[in-house]
């Protein structure tokens, strides 16, 4: 089987959503957990993560082979404390298989703006107050 993990971000007003999406087959879901870590280059685990989610075992319909499970971590107002390196990961508690997504970063600037870099999806969002740029 093939399990794919991707990272993305979306902005709603002052809120920043960090999203980990895992695509997998129904039979691959059991025992799998997806999680988001910050500043954990070597020891990212569900226990040290910001948020974790068990993979969906049911896509809700029967006419599909693949399921998408989505973990969303919401930052209501980005501050300098949120600066750092983030990574989406997944781990099977049954087989021990471990997946690691690309690192991405939040950089908070002195002007009160922030930038999210390293994401696969190239987005550019600008806001007048506490501006955020996704690139």
């Amino acid at each position: 089987g093939c399990i794919n993990i991707t990272s993305s971000a979306s902005q709603e007003g002052t809120r920043l959503n960090l999203i980990c999406t895992v695509w997998h087959k129904k039979e691959e879901a059991e025992g799998f957990v997806v999680f988001l870590c910050k500043d954990r280059s070597g020891d990212c685990s569900p226990e040290t993560s910001l948020k974790q989610l068990r993979l969906k075992r049911d896509p809700g319909i029967d006419g599909v082979g693949e399921i998408s499970s989505q973990l969303m971590f919401t930052i209501s107002q980005v501050t300098p404390l949120h600066s750092g390196t983030y990574q989406c990961c997944a781990r099977s508690q049954k087989s021990g298989i471990r997946l690691q997504g690309h690192f991405f970063s939040i950089l908070f600037t002195e002007t009160g703006n922030y930038t999210v870099t390293g994401l696969k999806q190239r987005q550019h969002l600008e806001f007048s107050h506490n501006e955020g740029t996704l690139s």
Epitope: R54, K56, D58, G60, I61, D62, G63, V64, M72
Partner: antibody, heavy 121, light 107 residues
Framework: QVQLVQSGAEVKKPGASVKVSCKAS????????MQWIRQAPGQGLEWIGA????????RVTQKFRGRATLTADKSTSTAYMELSSLRSEDTAVYYC??????????????WGQGTTLTVSS | EIVLTQSPATLSLSPGERATLSCRAS??????LHWYQQKPGQAPRLLIK???QSISGIPARFSGSGSGTDFTLTISSLEPEDFAVYFC?????????FGGGTKVEIK
């Protein structure tokens, strides 16, 4: 044993909103899709939408998009359906139902008792 | 959207007779079809899953068949408590949909 207990009957005026709750027990709430279905007097069953409490993914049929909001509270194992801009045609019994584990059951194996909504001026 | 068409709309039969209810899908849905029974004032009850698979606690006189677009629910010998409305429902794709129902009434 699995149980779905819905909130009581509601009477609303046209243009108002209603929020129906469905409290689940007897199974892992976050691992099954919760469906919302309605039945107008003397009519058939109409699927409104479904939510997966594990990650809050929701699907709402086109007819109700923008008017029906599905949410779930994992801490209380309760699903909610809010319907806004009510009109007289929304008068119906609203059911929540659990979709059984895919490939094992797949159909809606447990149903709430129904919540009667009356929309009248 | 997959449309499910049930026929007949009403079936008038006597206790002990055999009932054959049809459900036709507007496109192929494999075996992703389920049957429900509903009595007045009650919530529907799942009778058959995945076109032909039995459900625990449901009497053996209820059986289902079919695949693709044409499905059948058969009640081998009607009991007084079987007079009700029957719905089919597909779980193949979003949005999930129901058929319009077949009412089985006493002749």
């Amino acid at each position: 044993q699995v149980q779905l207990v819905q909130s009581g009957a509601e009477v609303k005026k046209p243009g108002a909103s209603v929020k129906v709750s469905c409290k689940a027990s007897g199974y892992t709430f976050s691992e099954s899709w919760m469906q919302w279905i309605r039945q107008a007097p003397g009519q058939g069953l109409e699927w409104i939408g479904a939510i997966y409490p594990g990650d809050d993914e929701a699907r709402v049929t086109q007819k109700f998009r923008g008017r029906a909001t599905l949410t779930a509270d994992k801490s209380t194992s309760t699903a909610y359906m809010e319907l806004s801009s009510l009109r007289s045609e929304d008068t119906a019994v609203y059911y929540c139902a659990r979709r059984g584990i895919a490939a094992v059951v797949g159909g809606f194996d447990y149903w709430g008792q129904g919540t009667t909504l009356t929309v009248s001026s | 959207e997959i449309v499910l068409t049930q026929s007949p709309a009403t079936l008038s039969l006597s206790p002990g007779e055999r009932a054959t209810l049809s459900c036709r899908a507007s496109q192929s849905i494999s075996n992703h079809l389920h049957w429900y029974q509903q009595k007045p004032g009650q919530a529907p009850r799942l009778l058959i899953k995945y076109a032909s698979q039995s459900i625990s606690g449901i009497p053996a006189r209820f059986s289902g068949s079919g695949s693709g677009t044409d499905f059948t629910l058969t009640i081998s010998s009607l009991e007084p408590e079987d007079f009700a409305v029957y719905f089919c429902q597909q779980s193949n794709s979003w949005p999930l949909t129901f058929g319009g129902g077949t009412k089985v009434e006493i002749k």
